[in-house]
Amino acid sequence: MAPWPELGDAQPNPDKYLEGAAGQQPTAPDKSKETNKTDNTEAPVTKIELLPSYSTATLIDEPTEVDDPWNLPTLQDSGIKWSERDTKGKILCFFQGIGRLILLLGFLYFFVCSLDILSSAFQLVGGKMAGQFFSNSSIMSNPLLGLVIGVLVTVLVQSSSTSTSIVVSMVSSSLLTVRAAIPIIMGANIGTSITNTIVALMQVGDRSEFRRAFAGATVHDFFNWLSVLVLLPVEVATHYLEIITQLIVESFHFKNGEDAPDLLKVITKPFTKLIVQLDKKVISQIAMNDEKAKNKSLVKIWCKTFTNKTQINVTVPSTANCTSPSLCWTDGIQNWTMKNVTYKENIAKCQHIFVNFHLPDLAVGTILLILSLLVLCGCLIMIVKILGSVLKGQVATVIKKTINTDFPFPFAWLTGYLAILVGAGMTFIVQSSSVFTSALTPLIGIGVITIERAYPLTLGSNIGTTTTAILAALASPGNALRSSLQIALCHFFFNISGILLWYPIPFTRLPIRMAKGLGNISAKYRWFAVFYLIIFFFLIPLTVFGLSLAGWRVLVGVGVPVVFIIILVLCLRLLQSRCPRVLPKKLQNWNFLPLWMRSLKPWDAVVSKFTGCFQMRCCCCCRVCCRACCLLCDCPKCCRCSKCCEDLEEAQEGQDVPVKAPETFDNITISREAQGEVPASDSKTECTAL
């Protein structure tokens, strides 16, 4: 099982609560409340307060506002004030601003393009495998298998719209029922949230920035996972999504609409199509068991083709087998008839880099994967650097206030819903939730947007991507219209249901708390971010897939004990936080477990040893490489060429904040180990610079 952070011997104080509406910045208690933490996990902790379960506070005493890692950083404006500049200085400043804006838009453009190419790369590397996942006949009877296939396929092709369109074509070809398709759509929803999590990994250089960015990205993951955790069993039991969408589809007489407008693609396509063009039909054909498609390349070679309906002559056993009696003859040896065929003639080759290389898909995919990740990383670093230089002083204050401030009382509650609409609208404009949430991630990292505000924007993005799908469904041909519309509506109502579960009531906003917890852990142990990514998006789905293939009995045999252990741990945590006296002394904390089962420290040591040999070598290659090194090895002093990994570790070691009692079962991932650190110094701007 995955390790979890240290859980100290905390004694809760049930008489005192710190109340505060979730979603606001926590108010800081007195500085006098702070106590220094020692390395001894057995040591009792003083001044402990228990917070109610709906608080977004974690297992530590609230530090002062300055020390709260979740407080947005103040970006000091070190430059000369506008009023103090001379005319020449003002002109220079103006052109600098214009230059920065152009650079920002340029890097943003290549950032979006690299996301598109990253998706193509994933499709080339794993698209055919993704297609084969769909051709598994067990999907029909096993919703859990459908779910993990949805996750795996979307992760492999880096596009929920691709996996959804495969599902649509399978449903309209009667290879899949709508009932069997719903779990796949749920899985696709989860799979699409990996993109912005990968983008967050690029901000690994600065701890506090990484904490915010990673939490901001994983809030999407947790929302999707939690929604599935609740809604999949509900759907299996009641089929409410299937029933509601069926009623909608049957009650309206839809006419085929126009194609969903390609707004962002219009700008990015001219560039991305020069890099690579894919024939996405191949994945769908593989999913539909087309044997010929397995040998086809996904790389599009011919862009201009002439399709001519013609009659070809085919041999038949005898003239009795003729398609048309008048179109039948013999040449004395064979019997012939005419058959109508669509003849495709290649006219012009595509104009992209790989058109004449004739490389295998895996090779092209690997090249593009590496290049797109490098461009993605480089663009992100530059975006963060430019934003960091632009968003200082007054500008930052205005933007932060505009984005993060609520409406005046009594309409404060409406702000989040407006953010949902903004998220949906922006996603509709860019035609991709991945692009929108990925663009949001660095803004969360540098502290322009709070996680509390990013959460509704992300939820809106989930809605936005489904409205795009609904429009695309309305534009689909007659035979696919019904099924594609029903699936798009299932996707829409699934997201609506998820929002109703995890947004309206502040204490149900578990994704925020869980993401913050994960952000804290990942900021301290940066390798854990990669570990999380691999576990949640690959290992768990692949394990479930493997067990499902082995049959129901094996899945239940392994799954039930695992689920039982998880429930047991959660119940134990709940009791430890609410009524520890009910439990035997030994079970009142986690100290009865070996250290490796309750702390990440021993795992960290293993990872550090394992990656130690790469530290010196990789750090001096390049700064992008150094970031990758920081992510894997958490190396505090290895980067002598670029200072991107120096994080004032010593300063952090001795300034940990005391642990609170674990108050809720849902923040199992949150601990003093993960949170006990001072955010990285503001002066260390090298971390976000190249």
Partner: antibody, heavy 120, light 107 residues
Framework: QVQLVQSGAEVKKPGSSVKVSCKAS????????IHWVRQAPGQGLEWMGG????????NYKQNFRGRVTITADESTSTAYMELSSLRSEDTAVYYC?????????????WGQGTTVTVSS | DIQMTQSPSSLSTSVGDRVTITCTAS??????VAWYQQKPGKSPKLLIY???TRHTGVPERFSGSGSGTDFTLTISSLQPEDVATYFC?????????FGGGTKVEIK
């Protein structure tokens, strides 16, 4: 230009065999079927059989089966028709003709004919 | 085997006259009929295939029509060089069979 050149006239004894050749030029031999048609003096045309040179698939008219063998040599673009157990009624002009494979254009080009006389 | 019956077996007419030769199949052959011209002492030459399609280089005065069992070859204006024997052939089913021929002469 398209040409089908046949071998010279033959005089044969009853019971013997005759092998007539047909050399093709001016077209892709393998893209066509080579048919053999005979015409007895003052009579109509009678189809004997044919061959697809690129795969050596043959077909013969029922009343010639067992007596006629049609072969083709791709390397020399030549088709052969061998008729065994010759009888006096086999006296005829033997023509080779080409037919475009997989096409319904019929026998669009013929050889000049080979006269085979069977007499004791 | 499908029998192809041609009529008349011979005809004599003047230059410029319209000549019609008919061919009847013993069973439905669709449009799988060809017409050949054989001049005295020469090998046959393809005129019409697929009942009505003129072969390359064949003069426009030659035309074919019909489907099923009844087929016609028409020479709209007979020329001296058209003196020959004309054969119809079906290629609907194997074996390929020819008509008995129609001998065309000029008066």
């Amino acid at each position: 230009q398209v040409q089908l050149v046949q071998s010279g006239a033959e005089v044969k004894k009853p019971g013997s065999s005759v092998k007539v050749s047909c050399k093709a030029s001016g077209f892709f031999f393998t893209e066509y079927i080579i048919h053999w048609v005979r015409q007895a003096p003052g009579q109509g045309l009678e189809w004997m059989g044919g061959i697809i040179p690129n795969n050596d698939v043959t077909n013969y008219k029922q009343n010639f089966r067992g007596r006629v063998t049609i072969t083709a040599d791709e390397s020399t673009s030549t088709a052969y028709m061998e008729l065994s157990s010759l009888r006096s009624e086999d006296t005829a002009v033997y023509y080779c003709a080409r037919w475009r494979n997989a096409y319904y254009s019929a026998m669009d080009s013929w050889g000049q004919g080979t006269t085979v006389t069977v007499s004791s | 085997d499908i029998q192809m019956t041609q009529s008349p077996s011979s005809l004599s007419t003047s230059v410029g006259d319209r000549v019609t030769i008919t061919c009847t199949a013993s069973q439905d052959v669709g449009t799988a009929v060809a017409w050949y011209q054989q001049k005295p002492g020469k090998s046959p030459k393809l005129l019409i295939y697929w009942a009505s399609t003129r072969h390359t280089g064949v003069p426009e005065r030659f035309s074919g029509s019909g489907s099923g069992t009844d087929f016609t070859l028409t020479i709209s204006s007979l020329q001296p060089e058209d003196v020959a024997t004309y054969f119809c052939q079906q290629y609907r089913t194997s074996p390929l069979t020819f008509g008995g021929g129609t001998k065309v002469e000029i008066k």
